[in-house]
């Protein structure tokens, strides 16, 4: 140990430790947690919930979403590939996050734990799969101006960008927890 | 054990853990000053980062993790005599349920796992 440093081991007792596995399940359960509350205000402050305008604020965006070429359906089920696409989609998730931000007024700290809580979960699907190098990250330039551009939209397309954010993550994430349930 | 500082001194603790992952938990310091209740010091959650200080200790004490090294540490500065006491880490999941209340922490009833402490003697 160092000067100046003092070194105390924690040794487990003798309840089973948390897995992988059982950490990445609950922490996804957080973030879907945190995902109904801010849908809460969302829906409680708009319309948007039953809208069915959707479609026309969803070309604008590029949310990632499971295809059946993405490994992670039971039909097809290819755990490399989709655990690639399960952390490049969460890695695309950030800046629509981040867009979230400055969208909530009584639920900014549930904004911020959604955000903080995602790149947890990004940590420690990047520790599962330490040996794969198809991971790609974000261009931070696009992310920027993909980021100034929403922020540029009008009220009732910025009220329909975060409805349509919300959705897709919980639908990402559903589909990720299904998955990783079968690695 | 730990160590004998003088006042306004600094001492980096550390709490290295085996058969489990930190990472996956939420950590908690606590300290027992002579004759005194346990106090909890400082927190981390592992869900979203959020950190606790006691008003006693904020901005002196920094609480940090190293998953490489499987370790967290308490970064204690500028120290006053009355930061005497024993020292000791624990582990545990009072953080995975979404809008945890952070101040439940300082709970030594919210921990699964705990370091055995270390004496801290602030004096000169």
């Known amino acids: 140990v160092p000067p100046g440093e003092d070194s105390k081991d924690v040794a487990a007792p003798h309840r089973q430790p948390l897995t992988s596995s059982e950490r990445i399940d609950k922490q996804i359960r957080y973030i879907l947690d945190g995902i109904s509350a801010l849908r809460k205000e969302t829906c409680n402050k708009s319309n948007m919930c039953e809208s069915s305008k959707e479609a026309l604020a969803e070309n604008n965006l590029n949310l990632p979403k499971m295809a059946e070429k993405d490994g992670c359906f039971q039909s097809g089920f290819n755990e490399e590939t989709c655990l690639v696409k399960i952390i490049t989609g969460l890695l695309e998730f950030e800046v629509y996050l981040e867009y979230l931000q400055n969208r909530f007024e009584s639920s900014e700290e549930q904004a911020r734990a959604v955000q903080m809580s995602t790149k947890v979960l990004i940590q420690f699907l990047q520790k599962k799969a330490k040996n794969l190098d198809a991971i790609t990250t974000p261009d931070p330039t696009t992310n920027a101006s993909l980021l100034t551009k929403l922020q540029a939209q009008n009220q009732w397309l910025q009220d329909m960008t975060t409805h349509l954010i919300l959705r897709s993550f919980k639908e990402f994430l559903q589909s990720s927890l299904r998955a990783l349930r079968q690695m | 054990g730990g160590g004998l500082v003088q006042p306004g001194g600094s001492l980096r603790l550390s709490c290295a853990a085996s058969g489990f992952t930190l990472d996956y938990y939420g950590i908690g310091w606590f300290r027992q000053a002579p004759g005194k209740e346990r106090e909890g010091v400082s927190c981390?959650?592992?869900?979203?980062?959020?950190?606790y200080y006691a008003d006693s200790v904020k901005g002196r004490f920094t609480i940090s993790r190293d998953s490489a090294k499987n370790t967290v540490y308490l970064q204690m500065n500028s120290l006053k005599p009355e930061d005497t006491g024993v020292y000791y880490c624990?582990?545990?999941?009072?953080?995975?349920?979404?809008?945890?209340?952070?101040?439940?922490?300082?709970?030594?009833?919210?921990?699964?796992?705990r370091g055995q402490g270390t004496q801290v003697t602030v004096s000169s």
């Open positions: 624990a582990a545990g999941t009072w953080d995975l349920k979404f809008g945890y209340n952070i101040t439940t922490c300082v709970r030594s009833s919210e921990y699964d796992y």
């Open positions: 981390m959650s592992s869900s979203d980062l959020k950190t």
